[in-house]
């Protein structure tokens, strides 16, 4: 799988300038070479603290691995040093430079930095496996609703063409290990599991290898089981309102529900001077409820036209489904027409239960 990026053989201790962010440099070194990767700050500006990462894991400095803010040196390189390297901003984890490094059996020519190496050009160069799109392999955690399908991919290359195998929680993973089996596509470097269930949770590792080396990537799968819940009402809605006599007012209520919700708008009223009945239930009148041709969207808005002083008071958005009910309330204050409009002090939702 070609990236269309420059691929060249780099001589011993050659320093490789970093590619533009978002591009990927494919580099080949000989066994025993010093790998030097350089990642200057984008636009020449300040870089801030950085971290160097290989195959998704932060590199630990050692006598052989020399880590600087803009440069990485790996001395006496071997096959195990092949892989995907990136330089990232420490705080944001933003990738500043990508490199795909292959360390081949033979030492590199030492002089040739322009990609004119004959073995490389003729495609007979041997090399350990490497990820063809390492920047796509940064994400490691996949959370999937049960009953859906999962695909893990580890596209790689190498010469000879590497083989791919899969592990689950560190052990060989085969079709007979799960109900429904698995589907492997070696030419797509992929593992597919249909209709996942909670027992599919775990760590899945692809192991890509040829006689020159081996690389691996581990993904974590979480299978989500939904637990039904009563409707959720968006915080802050409906909001308290202050309106001038004769003006129009809208209250909004945003409802989230798995099960089909039933939405009602209620106005709190007094009966014989009391706001609540003997059992403590508020007295309300239903202003708006579902009809044959009303949509949920329409029910999420309560419109009051040409308001009077009688419209002042407490309004409640009540939403119910098969699991339970939720409600939020807000107040309407009506001012005389000649008064200046004053915002309600306690703007926002009054949560009622």
């Amino acid at each position: 799988e070609s990236l269309g990026t420059e691929q060249r053989v780099v001589g011993r201790a050659a320093e490789v300038p970093g590619p533009e962010p978002g591009q990927q440099e494919q580099l080949v070194f000989g066994s025993g070479d010093a790998v030097e990767l350089s990642c200057p700050p984008p636009g020449g500006g300040p870089m801030g603290p950085t971290v160097w990462v290989k195959d998704g894991t932060g590199l630990v400095p050692s006598e052989r691995v020399l880590v600087g803010p803009q440069r990485l040196q790996v001395l006496n390189a071997s096959h195990e040093d092949s892989g995907a390297y990136s330089c990232r901003q420490r705080l944001t984890q933003r990738v500043l430079c990508h490199f795909s490094v292959r360390v081949t059996d033979a030492p590199s020519s030492g002089d040739d930095e322009d990609g004119e190496d004959e073995a490389e050009d003729t495609g007979v160069d041997t090399g350990a496996p490497y990820w063809t799109r390492p920047e796509r392999m940064d994400k490691k955690l996949l959370a999937v609703p049960a009953a859906n399908t999962v695909r893990f991919r580890c596209p790689a290359a190498g010469n000879p063409t590497p083989s791919i195998s899969w592990l689950k929680n560190g052990r060989e993973f085969r079709g007979e290990h799960r109900i429904g089996g698995i589907k492997l596509r070696h030419q797509q470097w992929s593992l597919v599991m249909e209709s996942v269930v909670p027992s599919d949770r775990g760590n899945y590792t692809c192991v890509v290898e040829n006689k020159f080396g081996s690389i691996r990537q581990t993904y974590t799968l979480d299978v989500l089981e939904r637990s039904p819940h009563r409707p959720i009402l968006q915080a802050g809605l409906p909001a308290n309102q202050t309106a001038v006599l004769g003006s129009d007012v809208e209250f909004h209520c945003k409802v989230y529900s798995d099960a089909q919700p039933h939405i009602q708008w209620l106005k709190h009223v007094e009966v014989n001077g009391s706001k609540v009945g003997p059992d403590g239930t508020p007295y309300v009148t239903v202003l708006k409820t579902a009809g044959a041709n009303t949509t949920d969207k329409e029910l999420e808005v309560l419109s009051l036209h040409n308001v009077t002083f009688e419209d002042a008071g407490e309004y409640t958005c009540l939403a119910g489904n098969s699991i339970g009910f939720s409600h939020h309330s807000a107040w309407l204050v009506v001012l005389p027409a000649e008064e200046e409009l004053v915002e309600a002090d306690e703007a926002g939702s009054v949560y009622a239960g």
């Epitope: 490691k140 999937v144 859906n148 797509q188 597919v192 798995d258």
Partner: antibody, heavy 127, light 107 residues
Framework: EVQLVESGGGLVQPGGSLRLSCAAS????????ISWVRQAPGKGLEWVGR????????NYADSVKGRFTISADTSKNTAYLQMNSLRAEDTAVYYC????????????????????WGQGTLVTVSS | DIQMTQSPSSLSASVGDRVTITCRAS??????LAWYKQKPGKAPKLLIY???FLYSGVPSRFSGSGSGTDFTLTISSLQPEDFATYYC?????????FGQGTKVEIK
């Protein structure tokens, strides 16, 4: 056995409304999604929209956005297609289909596959 | 929108023939392509998903291949029940779009 049964089709005047139902059985309703696909007489298939039954999220084709609404009642295992402001070009057989996602970290989209379909219900918009 | 173009629009073949239908996307859709089969007056049926994965219960004479913009559905040995209209459909982009269909008729 997975089954989807549409109902609610019929003759309606331009500008009118209709609500189609899709009753599902044989699978865990809230785990996957329901798509609506239509087929005008003698024509090909056109995707109308989709809802994810777990989180209630919806997507619509531009041709129906603002006029059609997909919803679901998980207690009844039923999805709905509310069609308002109907036009002559909405005349078609409407199918609902169970829709599952193929989740893949390697790409930045979810592939959606419609694996079980209902028998379809005919909606005719005519004066 | 991503346009899906199938070819041919129709073809005539005999039982036992090998039949190939192609589908071209107006932009790269990776392997996010499904194939459906529809008989007159019936609902479509899923055959292939993700370009090359055979859906469960579908006979192995059906196979799919391709990635990017060019895809192929192959029926290795046409059977009487395979005479139908076949649609490809992509779902990388919004909205999901179908090809115009390929009608496979009896020669």
């Amino acid at each position: 056995e997975v089954q989807l049964v549409e109902s609610g089709g019929g003759l309606v005047q331009p500008g009118g409304s209709l609500r189609l139902s899709c009753a599902a059985s044989g699978f865990t309703f809230t785990s996957t999604g329901i798509s609506w696909v239509r087929q005008a007489p003698g024509k090909g298939l056109e995707w109308v929209g989709r809802t994810h039954l777990g989180d209630g999220s919806t997507n619509y084709a531009d041709s129906v956005k603002g006029r059609f609404t997909i919803s679901a009642d998980t207690s009844k295992n039923t999805a709905y297609l509310q069609m308002n402001s109907l036009r002559a070009e909405d005349t078609a057989v409407y199918y609902c289909a169970r829709t599952y996602g193929i989740y893949d970290l390697y790409v930045d989209y979810t592939e959606y596959v419609m694996d079980y379909w209902g028998q379809g219900t005919l909606v005719t918009v005519s004066s | 929108d991503i346009q899906m173009t199938q070819s041919p629009s129709s073809l005539s073949a005999s039982v036992g023939d090998r039949v190939t239908i192609t589908c071209r996307a107006s932009q790269d859709v990776d392997t996010s392509l499904a194939w459906y089969k529809q008989k007159p007056g019936k609902a479509p049926k899923l055959l292939i998903y993700s370009a090359s994965f055979l859906y469960s219960g579908v006979p192995s004479r059906f196979s799919g291949s391709g990635s990017g913009t060019d895809f192929t559905l192959t029926i290795s040995s046409l059977q009487p029940e395979d005479f139908a209209t076949y649609y490809c459909q992509q779902s990388t982009g919004h909205p999901q779009t179908f090809g115009q269909g390929t009608k496979v008729e009896i020669k």
